[in-house]
Interface confidence: low
């Protein structure tokens, strides 16, 4: 059968028909609809939005749309005891207090239920003490403080600027350094781009703006009380003392007006170098404590937030496949927001809504995809990827047998400069081919392909004439699918120019000022970048669900495996004497990579030549492609991170947002020169090389001829 006959498709119902149906005007309308009130996880407003989306997806034509609910641990400020930070004098009087809320943006003054800035899952507490400025609170910042500057953070309250790494890693690092509290703030150096006005006159962060966010270190566990299993009606819940990933010290975020008041009085050591200075008119002294006249003053935190088991709701829509209904391609993004969610997540949710509408239109005209497409509106992403993780835990047996691919759909934009893609190497060729067929929305690239503008603006550091595609890290809902279950995953959005804009994320991230107007006035008035992202995400889903042979190229995995092996070997070779002493060899890993390369090459040749009209052989070849990502999963997981099971990629132990390659070996080598027992440390390096080599070889063998 031709592919048309196989899926009851008529020639006009191809990818072009799907893409042509996507409309910028609809995305704009949906974004407006999703951003008029807050949709905080666990609230009635977010439940109502879940029901609205369920109803609309049914109208659009999906076969079924269900709500999947879970009862998970969430965190909220205490309405009667607000969180704040004060400077106290020697008599204990509060001589300065940080603000209790952000000034609301114009037009939103009368909106109720705007949650004040807080660090989700902070324990309660009222610590007081001297302040230490710890820059970004990265691992290397604490090394600088403790090892080079001999500054002890034990018993101190640390103040750290947001940016560079996930806030949960900052808190973990502060805890390990012995701090008794953490203040997080947004420095204009990171959240105020030069030459741009602050909101509402531009897209920069005003001094009273604050970034909310969770400070967990879940390492992929999902609900802190039910790691590994769904938080359903009969769940056994851990006690709060045994909960996964909760911080042990109070944490609170502030804006740069309030930070100025704390930092301007800092004394003690000068900043070690210019990389520790932000853009405030303060000395950026490290401390500990305040200078001269203010040395008797202390900082006191007042944190009263509570952790509560709360019901959350995912929306799961199904478009059944005509030929392979038991093969799932998933498009998912979250619905919950910190406040209005103008960018995060609703710029993504609006795109998903339009993609569902387009697929539904085709379905109403008699078309079906070859494979089943699942659409998901996740809840409680902001509280630790909880909705997606609980659903995947509940459906793990189905997903590991049937999951072809997961495409993530959080914020569609974090800028309007060029495309940004992070994905498994299996999807590189799919992304390249798709973007070559799409038109660029960029000024100066009229009539040119998206591939061309993307490659020009964001070139690959390795291959000239190709665009940069990054490794998947975490901090979003693909985590459980990729890092735990080994389902090929990818994400795409429009981003800023990282060369000229060094600030972290986008300035108004997780603040009350992330509104519909922010997007409509400053980022994408024509919604052309949103449309392009819809075409990329939707196009990927279409190809993954509809192509006869799965659009995965295993040879691209071979190329990156060699690159990653070279990289980790060069890190290890910084210790040539120890490698000799402890007989550390990477031969097994390089041999496995070589075998993988050869087998992948042979598999690709067979893939070109096999009889695609034979459904058994076709299914067999597709299964080998589908299960390749799964083959990189180690059932035992990474050391101390059982839910990070992918041997090739994991979120960095130092920054959840970033991906690390050969993470087991990398972590074993990290700071190895400081380990108390070098013999044991190098033994662990050898063990991790063994695990990696075995896994690569085992994955290669899944691509060999089956008999």
């Amino acid at each position: 059968k031709s592919s048309n006959e196989a899926t009851n498709i008529t020639p006009k119902h191809n990818m072009k028909a799907f893409l042509d149906e996507l409309k910028a005007e609809n995305i704009k309308k949906f974004l407006y609809n999703f951003t008029q009130i807050p949709h905080l996880a666990g609230t009635e407003q977010n439940f109502q939005l879940a029901k609205q989306i369920q109803s609309q997806w049914k109208e659009f034509g999906l076969d079924s749309v269900e709500l999947a609910h879970y009862d998970v641990l969430l965190s909220y400020p205490n309405k009667t005891h607000p969180n704040y930070i004060s400077i106290i004098n020697e008599d204990g009087n509060e001589i300065f207090n940080t603000s209790l809320f952000e000034p609301p943006p114009p037009g939103y003054e009368n909106v109720s239920d705007i949650v004040p800035p807080f660090s989700a899952f902070s324990p309660q507490g009222m610590p007081e003490g001297d302040l230490v400025y710890v820059n970004y609170a990265r691992t290397e910042d604490f090394f600088k403080l403790e090892r080079d500057m001999k500054i002890n953070c034990s018993g101190k309250i640390v103040i750290a600027r947001y940016g560079k790494v996930f806030r949960g890693n900052k808190v973990k690092n502060a805890q390990l350094a012995g701090a008794k509290g953490v203040i997080l703030y947004s420095d204009p150096a990171d959240y105020f781009a030069p030459g741009v006005k602050s909101y509402p006159d531009g897209w920069n962060l005003p001094g009273g703006g604050v970034q909310r966010g969770n400070i967990l270190n879940l390492n992929g566990a999902g609900d802190p009380l039910t790691p590994g299993y769904p938080a359903n009606e009969y769940a056994y819940r851990r006690g709060i003392a045994e909960a996964v990933g909760l911080p042990s010290i109070p944490v609170h975020p502030i804006g740069y007006y309030d930070a100025q008041k704390l930092l301007e009085k800092m004394g003690g050591s000068a900043p070690p170098d210019s990389s520790w200075r932000g853009s405030l008119k303060v000395p950026y002294n490290v401390g500990p404590g305040f200078t001269g006249n203010f040395s008797t003053q202390k900082v006191k935190m007042h944190i009263h937030s509570t952790n509560e088991v709360t019901r959350i709701y995912n929306v799961i829509g199904t478009l059944r496949g005509a030929v392979e209904p038991d093969r799932y391609v998933i498009l998912g993004g979250h619905r919950d927001s910190w406040v209005f969610g103008g960018i995060d997540p609703q710029s993504g949710a609006a795109v998903v809504h339009e993609i569902v509408r387009s697929f539904g239109t085709l379905k109403k005209e008699g078309w079906r995809p070859r494979r089943t497409i699942l659409f998901a509106s996740w809840d409680a992403e902001e509280f630790g990827l909880l909705g997606s993780t609980e659903w995947a835990e509940e459906n793990s047996r189905l997903l590991q047998e049937r999951g072809v691919a997961y495409i993530n759909a959080d914020s569609s934009i974090e800028g309007n400069y060029t495309l940004r893609v992070d994905c498994t190497p299996l999807m590189y060729s799919l992304v390249h081919n798709l973007t070559k067929e799409l038109k660029s929305p960029d000024e100066g690239f009229e009539g040119k392909s998206l591939y061309e503008s993307w490659t020009k603006k964001s070139p690959s550091p390795e291959f000239s004439g190709m665009p940069r595609i990054s490794k998947l890290g975490s901090g979003n809902d693909f985590e459980v699918f990729f890092q735990r279950l080994g389902i090929a995953s990818g994400r795409a959005r429009y981003t800023k120019n990282w060369e000229t804009n060094k600030f972290s994320g986008y300035p108004l991230y997780h603040s009350v000022y992330e509104t519909y107007e922010l997007v409509e006035k400053f980022y994408d008035p024509m919604f052309k970048y949103h449309l392009t992202v819809a075409q990329v995400r939707g196009g990927m889903v279409f190809e993954l669900a509809n192509s006869i042979v799965l659009p995965f190229d295993c040879r691209d995995y071979a190329v990156v495996l060699r690159k990653y092996a070279d990289k980790i070997y060069s890190i290890s070779m910084k210790h040539p004497q120890e490698m000799k002493t402890y007989s550390v060899s990477f031969d097994s890993l390089f041999s496995a990579v070589k075998n993988f390369t050869e087998i992948a090459s042979k598999f690709s040749e067979r893939l070109q030549d096999f009889d695609k009209s034979n459904p058994i052989v076709l299914r067999m070849m597709n299964d080998q492609l589908m299960f390749l990502e799964r083959a990189f999963i180690d059932p035992l997981g990474l050391p101390d991170r059982p839910f990070y099971r992918h041997v090739i990629y994991a979120p960095s132990s130092h920054n959840k947002y970033a991906g690390e390659s050969f993470p087991g070996i990398y972590d074993a080598l990290f700071d190895i020169e400081s380990k108390v027992d070098p013999s044991k440390a190098w033994g662990e390096v050898k063990r991790q090389i063994y695990v990696a080599a075995f896994t690569v070889q085992a994955a290669a063998e899944t691509l060999s001829e089956v008999a």
Epitope: S2, K436, G465, V549, A558, S601, Q608, D609, S613
Partner: antibody, heavy 116, light 107 residues
Amino acid sequence: EVKLVESGGGLVQPGGSLKLSCAASGFTFSNYWMNWVRQASGKGLEWVGEIRSQSNNFATHYAESVKGRFTISRDDSKNTVYLQMNSLRTEDTAVYYCTRRWNNFWGQGTTVTVSS
Amino acid sequence: NIVMTQSPSSVSASVGDRVTITCKASENVGTYVSWYQQKPGTAPKLLIYGASNRFTGVPDRFTGSGSATDFILTINNLQPEDFATYYCGQSYTFPYTFGQGTKVEIK
């Protein structure tokens, strides 16, 4: 046995047009991506372009030197791939080969001469 | 465009000799490299695909190796029918490109 047979070559004046055909047999033609490669007399091989299968939406890709002038198409019902050449230049003079994806099978070639 | 540079451009050898032809890519092309043999007046034939895999029916005296940017075609125990021109080519990215060819002549 896989067989590719090109036809349609000949002498044409600069600025003229020519359509080459490549008839395929011995394999499931509709599943395969097809390429055209050319070779000027005494010179090396130059890739001209590619057309993918229906499951890839018949996507086409071309060398810069022919982009906008040459068009590759296919008729799966006739097991044939075509190369429509417009605005021909003297430097397009070559033997044109049609090849199956990865260039693992080649036709015998057809000669195109562009001369006034 | 990725440039494939072959060396030498010609080599004189005798039956029974071992001949080595190298191909250098201007950028990393992984293992997406093929080797072709062409005799005068005929179409090229695929010898090696994926840098190191012999195509169906190709004698085992032909061996391909290499990855990333450096590739080698080795002909052991050269036979009379092996005197021809050999091309490398990459299909890693568009446009696909070929080396300029290496002519293996009778000494």
